[in-house]
């Protein structure tokens, strides 16, 4: 007789996820010096070991400790890139701009980015038919626990200046319910953190509105505002002459406006 | 703003007891890894011990292991140094001090020290 | 446990000069290191994180070097502020240890 099983709403933990996890652990240690040390099983012993065996709707940011402890990582706090809704841009141009880093160029963003994950109360497997939902099922589950953990904790290490990335093409520019919108904006340390600079990328090409007076990055700038932060804002027209001009700031087309 | 306040120091009687406290206002406290750094008068900086964020996990250096034990209270936002069998080579100002973490291998923000000195 | 061996541990110079600090590990510790400022009867201060990346606030006359065992502090143009005892901490593995301390005095 088979087992009963909790059906979720969302996919199940992505295939070959172990496997997954330690292989970029081993490339990720190999391409940053500093993170040589790491020792890749632990690691994956220890991000097993926050949601294995556990009810997947009550994962706490506790059960992830011993993976933060193994990911301990210094990122420089004033080359601090967020982004939201526009994570393929950003990765793009933390690629070309190589002292700046998105969450997902530090080793526990880089682990999961783009990964599911999901195990079962009282038994050492891993759910690959389905994880809860965070809107239908429960917030607490493991993807977003993890998420929420090392977001807020980015954002808390930003320091100086602090870029943003933002969707033009959305209808919400700046959306409260993103992880940026919910998490990191909150978790900037006024303290630390002298300025807020949004990008908002234009997506069509003839767009020559100016999207910094949208009424989500108005209400971007008075939360940031009444958080003692500075905020500003740019148009990115062009997000591929952008680009260009980050590889090539010499060539004579990028003293325009981009 | 952010601080760290350090408060329990004072004098103390060889094979004597004290318990260290430091306040946390002003960030996120379970964001934080909290240290103990002490320093004996007119000496260097000596690293003490550190607690987790969630206080699961601990560590010492050698010359206070088995005597001094960390902890911390999250809901009140305050570490602790509870300091027994004490030395006179315990004679030090205490301070704590936070690291951030994942992201941050570095102690940002110090307390302003309590004095602890071991005399009889 | 790593040791960390500072040199020299005083030295005297003016105004405007610029200073260099080494600090030295008994092993390979990558970029995990730290400075340190500290003035009679106050708190340590970070200076920079990391082996080179100055911290936030921290004037940019300082600044850091190095990777692996051998690494520098250096004040390009010593300032009355800066006159006091700096402190390299290696964070490669527990426990972290500090170096013994330079005293930067006035000539």
């Known amino acids: 007789v088979p087992r009963w099983r909790q059906q979720w709403s969302g996919p199940g933990t992505t295939k070959r996820f172990p496997e997954t996890v330690l292989a970029r652990c081993v490339k990720y240690t190999e391409i940053h010096p500093e993170m040589r040390h790491v020792d890749c099983q632990s690691v994956w012993d220890a991000f097993k070991g926050a949601f294995i065996s556990k009810h997947p709707c009550n994962i706490t940011e506790e059960d992830y400790q011993p993976l933060m402890k193994l990911g301990t990582q210094t990122v420089p706090c004033n080359k601090i890139l967020l982004w939201s809704r526009i994570k393929d841009l950003a990765h793009q141009f933390t690629q070309v701009q190589r002292d700046m880093f998105t969450l997902e160029d530090t080793l526990l963003g880089y682990l999961a980015d783009d990964l599911t994950w999901c195990g079962e109360f009282n038994t050492s497997k891993i759910n690959y038919q389905s994880c809860p939902d965070w809107r239908k099922d429960c917030s607490n589950n493991p993807v977003s626990v993890f998420w929420k953990t090392v977001s807020r904790r980015f954002a808390e290490a930003a320091c100086d200046v602090v870029h943003v990335m933002l969707n033009g093409s959305r209808s919400k520019i700046f959306d409260k319910n993103s992880t940026f919108g919910s998490v990191e904006v909150h978790n900037l340390q006024p303290e630390k953190v002298q300025t807020l600079e949004a990008w908002v990328i234009h997506g069509g090409r003839e767009d020559s509105r100016d999207l910094c007076q949208d009424p989500t990055i108005k209400e971007l700038e008075s939360i940031i505002s009444k958080r003692n932060i500075q905020f500003s804002c740019k148009n990115i027209y062009r997000p591929d002459k952008f680009l260009q001009c980050v590889k090539n700031p010499e060539d004579s087309s990028c003293t325009s406006e981009i | 703003q952010v601080q760290l306040v350090e408060s329990g120091g004072g004098l103390v009687q060889p094979g004597g007891s004290l318990r260290l406290s430091c306040a946390a206002s002003?960030?996120?406290?379970?964001?934080?890894?909290m240290h103990w750094v002490r320093q004996a008068p007119g000496k260097g900086l000596e690293w003490v011990s550190y607690i987790d964020s969630s206080g699961s996990s601990t560590y010492y250096a050698d010359s206070v292991k088995g005597r001094f034990t960390i902890s911390r209270d999250n809901s009140k936002n305050t570490l602790y140094l509870q300091m027994n069998s004490l030395r006179a080579e315990d004679t030090a100002v205490y301070y704590c001090?936070?690291?951030?973490?994942?992201?941050?291998?570095?102690?940002?923000?110090w307390g302003q020290g309590t004095l602890v000195t071991v005399s009889s | 446990d790593i040791q960390m061996t500072q040199s020299p541990s005083s030295l005297s110079a003016s105004v405007g000069d610029r200073v260099t600090i080494t600090c030295r590990a008994s092993?390979?510790?990558?970029?995990?290191l730290n400075w340190y400022q500290q003035k009679p009867g106050k708190a340590p201060k970070l200076l920079i994180y990391g082996a080179s990346n100055l911290q936030s606030g921290v004037p940019s006359r300082f600044s850091g070097s190095g990777s692996g065992t051998d690494f520098t502090l250096t004040i390009s143009s010593l300032q009355p502020e800066d006159f006091a005892t700096y402190y390299c901490q290696q964070y490669y593995d527990l426990p972290n240890t500090f170096g013994q301390g330079t005293k930067v005095e006035i000539k």
């Open positions: 092993q390979n510790i990558s970029q995990w």
């Open positions: 001090a936070r690291q951030l973490m994942p992201f941050g291998g570095y102690f940002d923000v």
């Open positions: 002003g960030f996120t406290f379970t964001s934080y890894y």
